[in-house]
Interface confidence: medium
């Protein structure tokens, strides 16, 4: 028996369902009584889900997994993982045994989009050209860690005096805070771009300082 899985990682958004595809080619006359199917975590060998002795043995992994029972006889051994969490990320191995056996691993990459950045300024009044200001760009609840870029109103990257910190919350999602310290010109727009490297999703925030009331 030959087991086939997708070579590319499966990308799943947090709190959505993901399907880890696995298939085999059943011989003529194949019956489910002959099938032993095991899904396990590749690294730790922890059992995730199994089908043996002609029946679905159920989820051994947080009760959030399911097979496609009606499709098994056609060779579809895919695993459904419900309400994906950050901790589900990793490699899963699909073992199929009929007379002989084969296995293959599929990677699950978990992702969550970052929120539109909020911008704060310190100090935020009585600003004059030549003043040093601190601009903070904050974006929340994303995964994996973000890439943060700053640029001025002309699109030129700002690299000096940038400090970025990322903190994971109890769900493993990251809140990112990036601080730019800059000397004000006469007028200035400062933009922050928070990029999710897996989703290739960009979230933009900007602040324009005119010496008049601030615009965000």
């Amino acid at each position: 028996v030959e087991v086939q899985v997708s070579e590319d990682p499966v990308v799943a958004l947090v709190d959505t369902d993901a399907t880890l595809r696995c298939s085999f080619s059943p011989e003529p006359g194949f019956s489910l009584a002959q099938l032993n199917l095991i899904w396990q975590l590749t690294d730790t060998k922890q059992l995730v889900h199994s089908f043996t002795e002609g029946r679905d043995q159920g989820s051994a992994y947080s009760n959030r997994t399911a097979l496609f029972p009606d499709l098994l006889v056609q060779g579809n051994a895919s695993l459904r993982l419900q309400r994906v969490r950050v901790t589900d990320e990793g490699s899963y191995t699909c073992f199929v045994s009929i007379q002989d056996f084969d296995s293959a691993a599929v990677s699950l990459q978990v992702a969550a989009p970052y929120s539109k950045p909020s911008m704060t300024l310190e100090p935020n009044k009585d600003l004059r050209p030549g003043n040093m200001v601190t601009i903070t760009c904050s974006s929340y609840q994303g995964y994996p860690e973000a890439e943060v870029f700053w640029k001025d109103g002309q699109g030129v990257p700002l690299t000096g005096n940038v400090t970025t910190s990322q903190m994971a919350n109890e769900r493993g999602l990251f809140d990112v805070h990036s601080v730019l310290r800059v000397v004000l010109g006469a007028n200035g727009t400062y933009s922050c771009l928070v990029r999710n490297p897996v989703l290739q999703q960009d979230a933009h925030g900007s602040v324009t300082i005119t010496g008049q009331p601030l615009t965000f």
Epitope: F149, G155, V156, P157, P197, H204
Partner: antibody
């Protein structure tokens, strides 16, 4: 001195495949984003694909999405472009270009001399 | 059809000043720095202007760049015969998540 040397071009039939390589030297290859840019005969420049320094982020022009795959081997200082399902309109000189900016595509400060890919039956 | 729009050709006599325009939109030139490349006949492109108006070392100060809103321009003063080349503007496009070039401008030095 920064050097980028492309290879792997040639004549291929429509629907065929080709793999281009770009050997880089004179800079710390693993620190910089890299791109492939092409130029059809007598035409302008067209950005094809880019890749982040570590290789985890890839970007493609719509015209090649799903057919071309960019990759890199930082241990070999080499950039690759795997081109599948080639079409006549892919005929061009393909340039390897180094980005001046660490971690994202922004501007190309060094270019190779290019390798010609001809797709024809 | 290029995302950035350039005139297909420009010309001038030696010593003259020539300007090449590059027009885009808010998602490219409007929000990212513009780069200009020079491609001499039969050669690979070369970086000419970056970050809208900065010159790499080795590029004469006869070449200058500027940007305003969603347009950019390249100015060449004291035109010389060796400036005859194709000139391209380029920048990142946030909407396309890709790099974009103008269609190129062929500069001819007359006389």
């Amino acid at each position: 001195e920064v050097q980028l040397l492309e290879s792997g071009g040639g004549l291929v039939q429509p629907g065929g495949s080709l793999r281009l390589s770009c050997a880089a030297s004179g800079f710390t290859f693993s620190d910089y984003a890299m791109s492939w840019v092409r130029q059809a005969p007598g035409k302008g420049l067209e950005w094809v694909s880019g890749i982040s320094p570590g290789g985890s982020n890839t970007y493609y022009a719509d015209s090649v999405k799903g057919r071309f795959t960019i990759s890199r081997d930082n241990s070999k200082n080499t950039l690759y472009l795997q081109m599948n399902s080639l079409r006549a309109e892919d005929t061009a000189v393909y340039y390897c270009a180094k980005d001046a900016w660490i971690a994202r595509l922004l501007l190309f400060d060094y270019w190779g001399q290019g390798t010609l890919v001809t797709v024809s039956s | 059809q290029s995302v950035l729009t350039q005139p297909p050709s420009a010309s001038g006599t030696p010593g003259q000043r020539v300007t090449i325009s590059c027009s885009g939109s808010s998602s490219n030139i409007g929000s990212n720095a513009v780069t200009w490349y020079q491609q001499l006949p039969g050669t690979a492109p070369k970086l000419l202007i970056y970050y809208n108006n900065k010159r790499p070392s080795g590029v004469p100060d006869r070449f200058s760049g500027s940007k305003s809103g969603t347009s950019a321009s390249l100015a060449i003063s004291g035109l010389r015969s060796e400036d005859e080349a194709d000139y391209y503007c380029g920048t990142w496009d946030d909407s396309l998540s890709g790099y974009v070039f103008g269609g190129g401008t062929k500069l001819t030095v007359l006389g």
